[in-house]
């Protein structure tokens, strides 16, 4: 909107706010068991891990902020089976970390998030 | 889990990860119009704003990370009514900013988020 109507500083603050809300990788915490699709008798300690995931707003309401590039981070977690038959096992869990994001019209057909090795 | 079974450094890393995923206020972006429940002929520029909202994990699956204290931040936004009858108006929109969070068993009865003044 024309700067003549409004204070330049106010417009600058609004614009900076808008830039910060744009679709980009953001640190978020994900629940490992639900992402892995594990049965209810298997759980992890800690149950959640911190990774970067795409989030934020797009210039059009119909677009969705989606990942375009992903790296996998290995997290050391305790895997616990109930009933407890053995000592909780320390396992490496590969978690998807979104490194690139884009506002896309539709969700991808195969969303991958976590790979157990 | 007993430290005797595992490397102290590994346990420390796991514990730090766990602390970072705990229920707490996290910077997030919210869509103003949908939070305000505005009709489609009223929209805001920018459409999204950055605020702190409760997020993260709880120790029990039955608990939800909810806000226990809230402050309201005033954001200067353009409110645009369509059909456009006048110049877009610069309005102060009060947006809920979560300042305290807790893992609670149920959602509160009255969730407040944005107040227009």
């Amino acid at each position: 909107f024309a700067a003549t109507f409004y204070d330049i500083e106010t417009l600058k603050v609004i614009d900076e706010e808008w830039q910060r809300t744009q679709c980009s990788p953001r640190e978020t915490c994900v629940e490992v068991a639900s992402e892995l699709g594990k049965s209810t008798n298997t759980f992890f300690k800690p149950p959640c891990v911190n990774v970067f995931r795409c989030g934020g707003c797009c210039n059009e309401e119909s677009l969705i902020c989606m990942n375009t590039s992903t790296s996998y981070i290995s997290k050391q977690l305790f895997e616990i089976s109930v009933p407890l038959t053995s000592v909780p096992e320390l396992v490496p869990v590969k978690v998807a970390n979104h490194t690139g994001c884009k506002c896309l019209p539709t969700a991808p057909r195969h969303p991958y998030s976590i790979i157990r090795r | 889990f007993a430290a005797t079974f595992y490397d102290i450094e590994t346990l420390k890393v796991i514990d730090e990860e766990w602390q970072r995923t705990q229920c707490s206020p996290r910077e997030t972006c919210v869509e103003v119009a949908s939070e305000l429940g505005k009709s489609t002929n009223t929209f805001f520029k920018p459409p999204c704003v950055n605020v702190f909202r409760c997020g993260g994990c709880c120790n029990e699956e039955s608990l939800i990370c909810m806000n226990t204290s809230t402050s309201y931040i005033s954001k200067q936004l353009f409110e645009i009514s369509v059909p456009l009858t006048s110049v877009p108006e610069l309005v102060p929109v009060k947006v809920a900013n979560h300042t305290g969070c807790k893992c609670l068993p149920t959602a509160p009865r009255h969730p407040y988020s944005i107040i227009r003044r």
């Epitope: 808008w18 797009c58 210039n59 059009e60 309401e61 119909s62 539709t106 969700a107 | -």
Partner: antibody, heavy 118, light 112 residues
């Protein structure tokens, strides 16, 4: 007020490339996607794709993929559309159009007529 | 691609009389977010297109209230309650739910 000013008419030979420009004013350039739409003489509208000026992300109509490139210069609030390997059926008026948050193409340039002839 | 089919392709109307244009899409235009991104554009002779209606029924700025839009799913209608001389031109429906964005083939509104 919002204005989209497009470059003048161009005549090109088959096989050549054309680059049309669209200078925006009266709004925050990076806050809106810019669409490119073409219209052959006496025909309807055809969507070519769009660019997000905030980060340069593009989405193209598959029909033009490999032949079209959309770019922006945020310093001058200008959007560009380059079409390569021109054919006679690329003769059309090429419009830039700003797209609102709600998806409608709310402001249009006056168009750039591109004539492809040998 | 989503095919947008408009009817009629030509509509001769008497000044002051109502006019109606239909637009049918080959797939539902309801987005996963619940919104329907169906828009109507007007193109007067020698002019660029102009947005009339966005998201099925919302009139854009400066558009007279004699223009109205309705419909849902795959069937949509643009109505002009009383046609005026300045309404002459081609009307297009367009969708922005799916990529590629597509347009109807256009309906030419002319005065009898």
């Amino acid at each position: 007020q919002v204005q989209l000013v497009q470059s003048g008419a161009k005549v090109k030979q088959p096989g050549a490339s054309v680059k049309a420009s669209c200078k925006a004013s009266g709004y925050t350039f990076t806050g809106y996607n810019m669409y490119w739409v073409r219209q052959a003489p006496g025909q309807g509208l055809e969507w070519m794709g769009y660019i997000d000026p905030y980060n340069g992300d593009t989405t193209y109509n598959q029909k033009f993929k490999g032949r079209v490139t959309m770019t922006t210069d945020t310093n001058t609030s200008t959007a560009y559309m380059e079409l390569r390997s021109l054919r006679s059926d690329d003769t059309a008026v090429y419009y830039c159009a700003r797209t609102s948050y709600y998806g409608g193409m709310d402001y249009w340039g006056r168009g750039t007529l591109v004539t492809v002839a040998s | 691609d989503i095919v947008m089919t408009q009817t009629p392709l030509s509509s001769p109307v008497t000044l002051g009389q109502p006019a109606s244009i239909s637009c049918r899409s080959s797939q539902s235009l309801v987005h996963s977010n619940g919104n329907t991104y169906l828009h109507w554009l007007q193109q007067r002779p020698g002019q660029p297109p102009r947005l009339l209606i966005y998201k099925v029924s919302n009139r854009f700025s400066g558009v007279p209230d004699r223009f109205s839009g309705s419909g849902a799913g795959t069937d949509f209608t643009l109505k002009i309650s009383r046609v005026e001389a300045e309404d002459v031109g081609v009307y297009y429906c367009s969708q922005s739910t799916h990529v590629p964005r597509t347009f109807g083939q256009g309906t030419k509104l002319e005065i009898k």
